[in-house]
């Protein structure tokens, strides 16, 4: 008999036939049978995990922790289900490995081809860093702005906690080393993260005391939006900051995006214990 669902993989799902479920309850459709939101179907003596997601055509690209780009978060979850492996959203937008779009006859500097610079000291700049060739020494500049990124704490491969995937990308760029998302939520043993100060240097911020204090202090600087901004935030509260031209949205739980218009599936990526969540 098969010993795990991975032994039963088929192109459309996982199919386990030819066993007696009274002798082996491993393949019963329970809350733990299908990981990564596969739908468990039991027909006769066959158990199949089906990954038939109803993904839409919205173009809101995301970059997965496996280095692949997806049209939107639903396609990423679909792939995670199909592969039965965890794929996290590392950043919004396509992964940085793509060159210019198109076929080579437009304005694109990339023109659909990977434009290879002549070998220079700039070749050492990696992980999203841009090179300042005018500097006397080799300077790798990280022009990554995480100020507009939603709060979604993550534990990274360097053992540190970060407020969101953008900050991990920023730290990876700043340190010029590979730092990846390991899991959702803060790291259990280490509660520090790196944040950039106004002068562009990095400082360690300790979150061990109370993460809510940060949110509370930030909220003090916000005022409710003027009436003509009614409907600006679909699932959240509209807030106006004195030092910001445009208002921002504080999203309700389960929503994300500039206007809280997108369902935030990422909050369900890592499931504690044997409980299986169903996406709605």
């Amino acid at each position: 008999f098969p010993t795990s669902l991975s032994d039963c993989q088929t192109p459309t799902g996982w199919n386990c036939s030819g066993y007696d479920d009274r002798e082996n309850d491993l393949f019963l459709c329970d809350t733990n049978t299908c990981k990564f939101d596969g739908e468990c179907l039991r027909i006769g003596d066959t158990v199949t995990c089906v990954c038939q997601f109803k993904c839409n055509n919205d173009y809101v690209p995301v970059c997965g922790s496996n280095g692949e780009s997806y049209q939107n978060e639903c396609y990423l979850r679909q792939a995670a289900c199909k592969q039965q492996s965890e794929i996290l959203v590392v950043s919004e937008g396509s992964c940085a490995t793509d060159a210019g779009s198109g076929s080579g006859d437009g304005v694109h500097e990339g023109s659909g081809e990977t434009s290879q610079k002549e070998t220079s000291t700039c070749d050492i700049c990696q992980f999203g860093a841009e090179c300042d060739e005018d500097a006397e020494d080799v300077w790798c500049v990280c022009n990554i702005d995480c100020s507009q990124t939603n709060f979604n704490p993550l534990c990274a491969s360097d053992g540190k906690s970060y407020d969101n995937a953008c900050q991990i990308k920023e730290a990876s760029c700043q340190k010029q080393e590979k730092i990846e998302v390991m899991s959702l939520g803060r790291c259990q043993d280490n509660t520090t993260t790196t944040t950039k100060s106004e002068d562009g240097h990095y400082a360690r911020t300790d979150y061990a005391e109370n993460a809510n204090k940060l949110e509370e202090s930030a909220r003090e600087h916000h005022i409710p939006c003027p009436e003509h901004y009614n409907g600006f935030c679909m699932h959240g509260k509209c807030e106006h900051s004195i030092n910001m031209q445009e208002p921002s949205c504080r999203c309700d739980a389960g929503y994300t995006g500039q206007h809280c218009e997108k369902k935030d599936y990422s909050v369900l990526y890592v499931v504690p214990g044997p409980v299986r969540f169903q996406y709605v």
Partner: antibody, heavy 112, light 108 residues
């Protein structure tokens, strides 16, 4: 390197059927939907619909329901557009698109 | 269905100039608007999506702005390769893509 390469120009008579192919490369085919767009001579773009490359489920715009069919050959990363019972007004260039990348277009001429 | 209205329909400019093309949506589409360039007989090229995010490889002389119903594409210091047709496109929230009527940018 991402490319969408479409089949060559077609000259058809009214009432015939045409099948246009779009071969994708340089990315994981099932990670992005495939859209089809029509551009009549000297005109703008008209979205025809899209196909979920993972499930194979097509969605058609109202003006393209009936004679038009999207299909896939996922194993070789190819999307197809088939137009049945061709009419003169089907004369146009048809593009496949994953939004950020477009095919080079297939020109279809329908004439008796 | 959402309607996208682009203006002007045609525009004449010289190399080095700055031009702005606008696009109006019939209802709030937040920031989900893209801009494409198309040259005669060629396929479209994505320039901007999410109203202001530059696509990979697009020169910084292109910039997008706006949200809600009003959007614009600005091209500074026009280059010879910038002449062609430009289209705006709504890309989120409904199953359809909706395109503007296009703006033809020609050399003065």
């Amino acid at each position: 390197q991402i490319h969408l390469v479409q089949s060559g120009p077609e000259l058809k008579k009214p009432g015939e059927t045409v099948k246009i192919s779009c071969k994708a490369s340089g990315y994981t085919f099932t990670n992005f939907a495939m859209n089809w767009v029509k551009q009549a001579p000297g005109k703008g773009f008209k979205w025809m619909g899209w196909i979920n490359t993972y499930t194979g489920e097509p969605t058609y715009a109202d003006d393209f329901k009936g004679r038009f069919a999207f299909s896939l050959e996922t194993s070789v990363s190819i999307a197809y557009l088939q137009i049945n019972s061709l009419k003169n007004e089907d004369t146009a260039t048809y593009f496949c698109s994953k939004f950020d990348y477009w095919g080079q277009g297939t020109t279809l001429t329908v004439s008796s | 269905d959402i309607q996208m209205t682009q203006s002007p329909a045609s525009l004449y400019a010289s190399v080095g100039e700055t031009v702005t093309i606008t696009c109006r949506a019939s209802e709030n589409i937040y920031s989900y608007l893209a801009w494409f360039q198309q040259k005669q007989g060629k396929s479209p090229h994505l320039l901007v999506y999410n109203a202001k995010t530059l696509a990979a490889g697009v020169p910084s002389r292109f910039s997008g702005s706006g949200s809600g119903t009003q959007f614009s594409l600005k091209i500074t210091s026009l280059q010879p390769e910038d002449f062609g047709s430009y289209y705006c496109q709504h890309h989120y929230g409904t199953p359809t893509w909706t395109f503007g009527g296009g703006t033809k940018l020609e050399i003065k």
